[in-house]
């Protein structure tokens, strides 16, 4: 170890590298300076990454993976650090960058936004489910008459092309449809979604954006919605919606209208079922809605409310129907 | 039915190569992602690898990327697994099973019967 | 350490309930990834036993059952039957594995 009496220098690591590893993916590599001395010390590495987006952290191995986008460039530095409880040591930085790709910004998509959704899957010999995506997105202001667009996601180690797209007049694709994917209902990782294109007339900028999971996931609405009325009590029961969570991972909101006076009642819940007290005058049209609570998963979307159940009297139909 | 059917395995010397195929029968099978998972003698399950239903997306074990190369042909209905620079470690039953997913989670539903590699010299 | 634990063997006779463990990790089981379980008969194939946690594919008797608590997992068979002496493994879904296919090393199954 080093002595508090001794003069340590500090030099940079050496064959800094910035490698592409997949859509919206680097890996930084670097190695330790042949010339530095005291290797038997805990030389650490602090790793900045100065564009898109500002961030350090320090590491003791020499590489680093980074999920980040890239259509704006990427530029990072790296500097070997010796720490102790009282100082800190610094060698200078070494730096690399990766240039923004080619093409003029004007002519690269806009408005990209992507949602999720579990359906259960047609093809599976058990009752599984699948995670769909639906991407949407504007053509760039810039971009030539005959650019086509072509939309990839990344989830974990999987990387897929788009193959099913919807297009505008001039035959240009606007929207993608996974059916089936390998995106996680319950997965932390990030979802990238890269958007280039191509035109004979000039180079396409390419656009990419990382998606949280919980931020885009389009939850199903409860299934199995009843409402029945005895008296003067609003009995509604539900279940939960087609969803990797189980059944204690969600919140519903149930929506009841009084169709008679228009009042309007919203309780929010973390149970599948509500009683409510009403007047037997009036009839009810009885919706309810659901979100993964936080309990499980950071907030995020609710679901479309759920098809409305009516009850009550109606003073067009009988009360039963034989 | 479901009927996965391997063939291709046999003996090789380290550094050799050899090409796994996998028949299959009983489901429409451009549907389907496809794997290869391996058992070493008296070993447990390794998964090898995975190619999407389209066969453009593929993904590898850490132990053998950049030496095998999965692949498909829709037409033929069969998956194969191209093998290079082989190692004894490589040593195995080769198993071809669909790569199923329940909510994202892969889970391999139907396995066929395996075929022997074995690399030595 | 990436990947699943289990106990390399168990034992149990006749008629008797056995449970075989798969202990995770934050990074699989913790994160609440689905686990399957593969049944295998010496000199066969792996055959799909359980999948997503505690679901039985046509044709396995509900003799057994997966659960799922924390980091880990178990299978249970009850009324244990000659039959059933095989090994089994745990599989589920790793963030941290390229590929992110992760099984347990497998227990093997003695029926007494």
């Known amino acids: 170890d080093l002595l508090p009496d001794e003069k340590i220098s500090l030099l940079p690591p050496v064959n800094f590298t910035i490698k592409v590893t997949g859509l919206a993916q680097v890996l930084l590599q670097w190695k330790p300076n042949p010339d530095q001395e005291q290797r038997n010390v805990n030389l650490e590495y602090q790793v900045k990454i100065n564009a898109p987006k500002e961030d350090d952290y320090e590491t003791r191995i020499t590489e680093s993976k980074c999920v980040t986008i890239l259509h704006k460039g990427f530029s990072a530095s790296v500097r070997t650090i010796l720490q102790n409880d009282h100082s800190l040591l610094a060698s200078s930085w070494a730096s690399a960058e990766l240039h923004a790709p080619p093409g003029s910004p004007g002519t690269s998509i806009v408005n990209l936004t992507c949602t999720t959704n579990t359906t259960e899957d047609n093809y599976s010999r058990l009752r599984s489910y699948q995670v769909s995506l639906h991407c949407t997105w504007l053509v760039g202001t810039d971009a030539p008459e005959d650019t086509q667009y072509f939309l990839y996601y990344r989830y974990g180690s999987w990387t897929e092309e788009c193959q099913e797209y919807s297009k505008d007049t001039l035959g240009r694709n606007i929207a993608c449809w996974f059916p089936r994917t390998f995106i996680l209902s319950k997965g932390r990782d990030w979802l990238a979604v890269l958007v280039n294109g191509s035109s004979k007339h000039s180079a396409i900028r390419p656009f990419d954006q990382l998606f949280a999971l919980h931020a885009i996931d389009q939850i199903n609405p409860p299934l199995n919605v009843t409402a029945e009325i005895e008296g003067t009590r609003l009995s509604i029961q539900w279940e939960k919606p087609v969803s990797a969570f189980p059944i204690h991972c969600f919140d519903y909101e149930v929506k009841i209208h009084n169709t008679r006076n228009g009042y309007l009642q919203i309780e929010k819940l973390m149970t599948n079922a509500f009683i409510s007290i009403i007047d037997d005058l009036s009839k009810y049209d009885v919706q309810v809605r659901a979100a993964v609570s936080s309990m499980c998963r950071e907030a995020g979307l609710w679901s479309e409310w759920s098809q409305p159940i009516y009850v009550g009297n109606d003073e067009h139909k009988p009360l039963r129907e034989w | 039915q479901v009927t996965l059917k391997e063939s291709g395995g046999g003996l090789v010397q380290p550094g050799g190569s050899l090409r796994l195929s996998c028949a299959a029968s009983?489901?429409?099978?451009?549907?389907?992602?496809m794997s290869w998972v391996r058992q070493a003698p008296g070993k447990g399950l390794e998964w090898v690898s995975a190619?999407?239903?389209?066969?453009?997306?593929?993904n590898y074990a850490d132990s053998v990327k950049g030496r095998f190369t999965i692949s498909r042909d829709n037409a033929k209905n069969t998956l194969y697994l191209q093998m290079n620079s082989l190692r004894a470690e490589d040593t195995a039953v080769y198993y071809c099973?669909?790569?199923?997913?329940?909510?994202?989670?892969?889970?391999?539903?139907?396995w066929g019967q395996g075929t022997t590699v074995t690399v030595s010299s | 350490q990436a990947g699943l634990t289990q106990p390399p063997s168990v034992s149990a006779a006749p008629g008797q309930r056995v449970t075989i463990s798969c202990s995770g990790s934050r990074s699989n089981i913790g994160s609440g990834y689905d686990v399957h379980w593969y049944q295998q008969v010496p000199g066969t194939a792996p055959k799909l036993l359980i999948f997503d946690d505690n679901n039985r594919p046509s044709g396995v008797p509900d003799r057994f059952s997966g659960s799922k608590s924390g980091t880990s997992a178990s299978l249970a068979i009850t009324g244990l039957q000659a039959e059933d002496e095989a090994d089994y493994y745990c599989?589920?879904?790793?963030?941290?594995?390229?590929?992110?296919?992760?099984f347990g090393g497998g227990t093997k199954l003695t029926v007494l």
């Open positions: 599989q589920s879904y790793d963030s941290s594995l390229s590929g992110h296919v992760v």
């Open positions: 190619i999407n239903s389209g066969g453009k997306s593929t």
């Open positions: 099973a669909d790569y199923a997913t329940n909510y994202g989670v892969p889970y391999f539903g139907s």
């Open positions: 009983g489901f429409t099978f451009s549907n389907y992602a």
